[in-house]
Amino acid sequence: LIIGFGISGRHSITVTTVASAGNIGEDGILSCTFEPDIKLSDIVIQWLKEGVLGLVHEFKEGKDELSEQDEMFRGRTAVFADQVIVGNASLRLKNVQLTDAGTYKCYIITSKGKGNANLEYKTGAFSMPEVNVDYNASSETLRCEAPRWFPQPTVVWASQVDQGANFSEVSNTSFELNSENVTMKVVSVLYNVTINNTYSCMIENDIAKATGDIKVTESEIKRRSHLQLLNSKAS
């Protein structure tokens, strides 16, 4: 969490941002809140990016002002216009690119004063893994697949019964570049699995950590998966 305060002249206002991560090829949100004002027409929101000449986005007098927007953000940004009045200056970013990573500044002017806060935005790719029994294999085998990751993640297998066991010798992981030549498909195979056990396939890079669990019994197969973004810090 980053909390920024205004500078000289008028009173300062508190602006708060949260470091976040964007998933390449999806929409992302850059979070920013501020002390609200009574009149929408008195609020100015400017989003800037370090190293970029033009603005990322500007909102003033109740509407978007695009004349100074940088080429790399054209047609890809919007604020939540109906929430600005309650102090939400968060930016919606369409079709996140790898190059969108960097330091952003959320700069606010209201009738109460000015304020700004920086935000670190990471970009990469992350997706939920799915673990299945590989019936084509000669022995009892599990196959963990996740369609989109970047940077290249690590893949670790674990089991409920053999806690702390190292499965690197009985697993094989491959990374296949996707068609856009950035993200990769992750496939990991675990051999010699035993029945009545829960196995977990854990995929992690510096942006996200995802886990796919599978419980195989004689009568049924249960699956569960979850994904967690790393390093979400508020400012």
Epitope: G25, D64, L66, F73, N95, Q97, P147, S179
Partner: antibody, heavy 120, light 107 residues
Framework: EVQLVESGGGLVQPGGSLRLSCAAS????????MSWVRQAPGKGLEWVAY????????YYSDSVKGRFTISRDNAKNTLYLQMSSLRAEDTAVYYC?????????????WGQGTTVTVSS | EIVMTQSPATLSLSPGERATLSCRAS??????LHWYQQKPGQSPRLLIK???QSISGIPARFSGSGSGTDFTLTISSLEPEDFAVYYC?????????FGQGTKLEIK
Amino acid sequence: EVQLVESGGGLVQPGGSLRLSCAASGFTFSNYYMSWVRQAPGKGLEWVAYVSSGGGSTYYSDSVKGRFTISRDNAKNTLYLQMSSLRAEDTAVYYCTRESYSQGNYFDYWGQGTTVTVSS
Amino acid sequence: EIVMTQSPATLSLSPGERATLSCRASQSISDYLHWYQQKPGQSPRLLIKFASQSISGIPARFSGSGSGTDFTLTISSLEPEDFAVYYCQNGHSFSLTFGQGTKLEIK
């Protein structure tokens, strides 16, 4: 050659449901945002919804929000529009469209359209 | 929501004449304005992107101009195949809106 072929249109009663499909070929489907745009008889064009290239992000026009669901299957190169709680005003030709690659929100390719008629 | 207004609703001209179609946005959209042509029984096709950028395969007689709220599509010398309906589209943000269209008909 880029091709978008819609299917699934037809006659449905008010309050009913329908699922439209769009089969894409001639380009790397998983790299592009896709949208549905509709056109009521004798009327203009209305953007309905988009889905991101990976399928994780969607956005809808106010007129269909909460009733329609856009989705995609990149393994099958297919775009979908699940329509429920249909109303007479949803009667239109529905076009599957490809959005420009990285920016600008314009539609560079369109399908031939599939007709949805909502009537009792 | 940004409202796009096209004028005139109908434009009657003869082949060889110059056509000027207008589109106005309810708020400034910089140059995030795109034009489409739709012939009867056909799907729309992209003519111009970002107010003035030409599209591969589109004849040079089609040109666009404008920025902010006011935009113009010009057809320098009308060919018989140009008689159709033309739509402008706001490409600025997430909610993408079209104008109601201008029908270009033979006089």
